[in-house]
Interface confidence: medium
Amino acid sequence: EPPTACREKQYLINSQCCSLCQPGQKLVSDCTEFTETECLPCGESEFLDTWNRETHCHQHKYCDPNLGLRVQQKGTSETDTICTCEEGWHCTSEACESCVLHTPCIPGFGVMEMATETTDTVCHPCPVGFFSNQSSLFEKCYPWTSCEDKNLEVLQKGTSQTNVICGLKSRMR
């Protein structure tokens, strides 16, 4: 009686169980009563990552440099290529199918978390007593200079974007 189910790594065709092709190989012809399943290795830049009966291998992913991508891990006949972002860029989504430039923190904002290959820069406004006077991917908010510590007086108050300006204390009259 012909089988209705097959063992692991087999498939049912024409009322008989044939062996699946191993990862890295594609199906050329099904087995018969007299012959084994015929498989062929995937070509260069192709892969199959499971035991399969596919007649075509899958193309390796293309890491398009103009989408900000580069190869993180080259594909093999059994694995796909893994892309990541160029330095200074981060993935636009979990899929990481394209990248965008890291966003610098503008003056008045400091870097709380530096950008990574998958996340953008996290900026926060400089609180009172701190400033940032430049656009930067890594600079934090700096504390205002303490004029008192230098035995000087404040000539101009600081802002979130500027440091205080210290000057010599005016003589008491």
């Epitope: 440099p65 899929a95 430039l101």
Partner: antibody, heavy 117, light 106 residues
Framework: EVQLQQSGPELVKPGASMKISCKAS????????MNWVKQSHGKNLEWIGL????????TYNQKFKGKATLTVDKSSSTAYMELLSLTSEDSAVYYC??????????WGQGTSVTVSS | QIVLTQSPAIMSSSPGEKVTMTCSAS?????IHWYQQKSGTSPKRWIY???KLASGVPARFSGSGSGTSYSLTINSVEAEDAATYYC?????????FGGGTKLEIK
């Protein structure tokens, strides 16, 4: 709000060339990729190519190599597509579309191109 | 190139019905993105990374799938959903679109 404003409709003669513009506002054009897409007869969408607006690097659909040239002017936040040696097959609506989340997030309103003598 | 085949090409539905359209890829892709286009307007990003709804897209929409088989489902279709929906892949150049599924509301 992010907006892509494309140049107006064009009626051009066979054999001529033309340039479509796509001006970005509401976000910096650099650091995003600008795609160009062709839609014929209000139906199929065909990806023409893309330009990395930061580096100026381009990737084309082989089918449109020699037909379309993509450029960017960072100072005016404008991307351009020049279409060369136009024929009736090139009559279509052309869209610019910026990627932000991996998909094409921001689309221009489209530029209708009619090639006719 | 990767060919994306959408089916059905045209479908008709009544308000309140559940609707599913499919996008089949000729070779395995990691993610599919969906766009909605209404007559005379530009396409709009609708679902990205297979299952994430773009901002402003009603929760009645959902996307799923993997490998070569993907789908877009509308749980309870409304008149405003009448449009053509296109799938798209970023995996291999040329980055292709499907032929579209036109959804008509009775």
């Amino acid at each position: 709000e992010v907006q892509l404003q494309q140049s107006g409709p064009e009626l051009v003669k066979p054999g001529a060339s033309m340039k479509i513009s796509c001006k970005a506002s509401g976000y910096s054009i650099t650091g995003y990729t600008m795609n160009w897409v062709k839609q014929s007869h209000g139906k199929n969408l065909e990806w023409i190519g893309l330009i990395n607006t930061y580096t100026g690097g381009t990737t084309y659909n082989q089918k449109f190599k020699g037909k379309a040239t993509l450029t960017v002017d960072k100072s005016s936040s404008t991307a351009y597509m020049e279409l060369l040696s136009l024929t009736s097959e090139d009559s279509a609506v052309y869209y610019c579309a910026g990627t932000g989340t991996g998909a094409m997030d921001y689309w221009g309103q489209g530029t209708s191109v009619t090639v006719s003598s | 190139q990767i060919v994306l085949t959408q089916s059905p090409a045209i479908m008709s539905s009544s308000p309140g019905e559940k609707v599913t359209m499919t996008c089949s890829a000729s070779s395995s892709v990691s993610y599919i993105h969906w766009y909605q286009q209404k007559s005379g307007t530009s396409p709009k990003r609708w679902i990205y990374d297979t299952s994430k709804l773009a901002s402003g897209v009603p929760a009645r929409f959902s996307g799923s799938g993997s490998g070569t088989s993907y789908s877009l489902t509308i749980n309870s279709v409304e008149a405003e959903d009448a449009a053509t929906y296109y799938c798209q892949q970023w995996r291999t150049n040329p980055y292709t679109f499907g032929g579209g599924t036109k959804l008509e509301i009775k």
